[in-house]
Amino acid sequence: SNQRRSPENSGRRYNRIQHGQCAYTFILPEHDGNCRESTTDQYNTNALQRDAPHVEPDFSSQKLQHLEHVMENYTQWLQKLENYIVENMKSEMAQIQQNAVQNHTATMLEIGTSLLSQTAEQTRKLTDVETQVLNQTSRLEIQLLENSLSTYKLEKQLLQQTNEILKIHEKNSLLEHKILEMEGKHKEELDTLKEEKENLQGLVTRQTYIIQELEKQLNRATTNNSVLQKQQLELMDTVHNLVNLCTKEGVLLKGGKREEEKPFRDCADVYQAGFNKSGIYTIYINNMPEPKKVFCNMDVNGGGWTVIQHREDGSLDFQRGWKEYKMGFGNPSGEYWLGNEFIFAITSQRQYMLRIELMDWEGNRAYSQYDRFHIGNEKQNYRLYLKGHTGTAGKQSSLILHGADFSTKDADNDNCMCKCALMLTGGWWFDACGPSNLNGMFYTAGQNHGKLNGIKWHYFKGPSYSLRSTTMMIRPLDF
């Protein structure tokens, strides 16, 4: 049989039987609209461990009645089909008998054989239909079983829920009782608090009087203090003058045993003088007319580091000109650039190493360290000289080792067809434009990806990741 779905009547099933030259189409009854077909998505009929979909209480009995009705229909159809075939056979036999006179015995035998095979085919088809009916019956029986199981489960759940509701009722009454108790306690506490408040007010009145008396005493002390301050300033001036005299003329102390200690050239000197707390210190740099306040890092890798650059919060604008990068800007207690002139002067005193501390927005820390670091003078565009790279911020150096000149927005000394300092912002030793720029724009978390002009250290976080914080610091090689 050739089963198909008709697009017009998609609810009906057609059984087409080819018999000799004739074709008979029997329209078999389908489930009517009330019988719910279960789809794979909705409910798997063979998966007994799953709950069946919710059904009305009398649906199973309806299904059984319907099944009986369908069975009766099928039986009627089968009888009709049998009668039809028998009738058909009679008429064909008559025709064969008429033709027998004219035809040979051999032909008759052939027709007989053909009829027999056709009869066998019809019988096989009938068996198929019967099998289909039986299959459907067994499927419905399984569904029925599942439904009864599901009903049992639901009843069980209902009982459980009823028990839970009872428990909740009990808890509720307990809570009500506790609330009443708490209300009583609350009233008592309020009365106590009122008493305490009155006591405190009395205390405040007494303390106000005491404070007024103390203020009077403080004013007297302040007057005395200003006199002391004046004296202290005079002493300080005297000490400074003495220090300067000792430094300039190499005066020997009375004992003649040791030279007066020289002022600190860098944070390494500060550390070696016994100051091992990180903070701001004043250093005296060779050939610089004024002392310079710097931040000294006394914690990292043995301490003694002079911080020359620091970024942490984006509070300071680093998109500045040549003069500002030359003399420095910002505050050593926060974000700042020490100044190229000072970096040049310090690194000309003795051999220095450079350490760069980095942190990304995920809290990962890394560093790059260089065994040798110094920069050229202004005429040389503060050219960068580095040797011996190590550290955790990438195997490759993100600073140009072969010597790059310093560029700012108003001084284009890079190797690019572009103006790196303008495009990437900030002053830096740009190449073309190179794998780093710690003086770029500060971008906050979430905004720090895909940035052309951010705080970049290529071999740590890639070419377009803007870092959270950076610190550049130097220390003498012989520390």
Epitope: C416, M417, D431, A432, P435, G450, L452, H458, G462, S464
Partner: antibody, heavy 122, light 112 residues
Framework: EVQLVQSGGGVVQPGRSLRLSCAAS????????MHWVRQAPGKGLEWVSY????????YYADSVKGRFTISRDNAKNSLYLQMNSLRAEDTAVYYC???????????????WGQGTLVTVSS | DIVMTQSPLSLPVTPGEPASISCRSS???????????LDWYLQKPGQSPQLLIY???NRASGVPDRFSGSGSGTDFTLKISRVEAEDVGVYYC?????????FGQGTKLEIK
């Protein structure tokens, strides 16, 4: 001096192979993405292939995919283009070009080689 | 692929006069980071192309200030305030926002 010097062009028969080289100097070659761009006689510019600074990312134009291979040797500051199964339509002047910036988006070709002519003819 | 369309394809100009070339892209070239990755190149006869303008409006080093670039999104313009004899050649626009990079067909600038 910052420059790109090309070599390896010439006349080749269809179906044969050719390897182009591009030697970089005067800049940190390992920091920049590199490209090959070609120009057929009397025609416009056509991008051919790209390789990232580390060599981990590679792209090809559909017209050369499966036939051309781009590679680089950062230790030797060199870029290469291996051209196999050459066709008549591959006839062009081939340029190596360097990204303008050390960045993961093409910001332009800041530097070009002098170009080398590849002629595919029987 | 992004299609870059230049106009005009041929531009005869008298020296000292201004010139303008338009470049349109089939999709916006404005990247999420705020940049338009569009460049202008000049290829003089018998030479390699050279960068004139990058990121839409930034003049490359050594490029005379008579050249300027403008535009955003899909419409870009290259202007030459006063054309000189040395400006002859083919001008190409190129986008790098979307892969693969694509060039315009070129505009041939010639002196009248």
């Amino acid at each position: 001096e910052v420059q790109l010097v090309q070599s390896g062009g010439g006349v080749v028969q269809p179906g044969r192979s050719l390897r182009l080289s591009c030697a970089a100097s005067g800049f940190t070659f390992s920091s920049y993405g590199m490209h090959w761009v070609r120009q057929a006689p009397g025609k416009g510019l056509e991008w051919v292939s790209y390789i990232s600074s580390s060599g981990s990312t590679i792209y090809y134009a559909d017209s050369v995919k499966g036939r051309f291979t781009i590679s680089r040797d950062n230790a030797k500051n060199s870029l290469y283009l291996q051209m196999n199964s050459l066709r008549a339509e591959d006839t062009a002047v081939y340029y190596c070009a360097r990204d303008l910036l050390d960045y993961d988006i093409l910001t332009g070709y800041g530097m070009w080689g002098q170009g080398t002519l590849v002629t595919v003819s029987s | 692929d992004i299609v870059m369309t230049q106009s005009p394809l041929s531009l005869p100009v008298t020296p000292g006069e201004p010139a303008s070339i338009s470049c349109r892209s089939s999709q916006s070239l404005l990247h999420s980071n705020g940049y338009n990755f569009l460049d202008w190149y000049l290829q003089k006869p018998g030479q390699s192309p050279q960068l004139l303008i990058y990121l839409g409006s930034n003049r490359a080093s050594g490029v005379p200030d008579r050249f300027s670039g403008s535009g955003s999104g899909t419409d870009f313009t290259l202007k030459i305030s006063r054309v000189e004899a040395e400006d002859v050649g083919v001008y190409y626009c190129m986008q790098g926002t979307h892969w693969p990079p694509t060039f315009g067909q070129g505009t041939k600038l010639e002196i009248k």
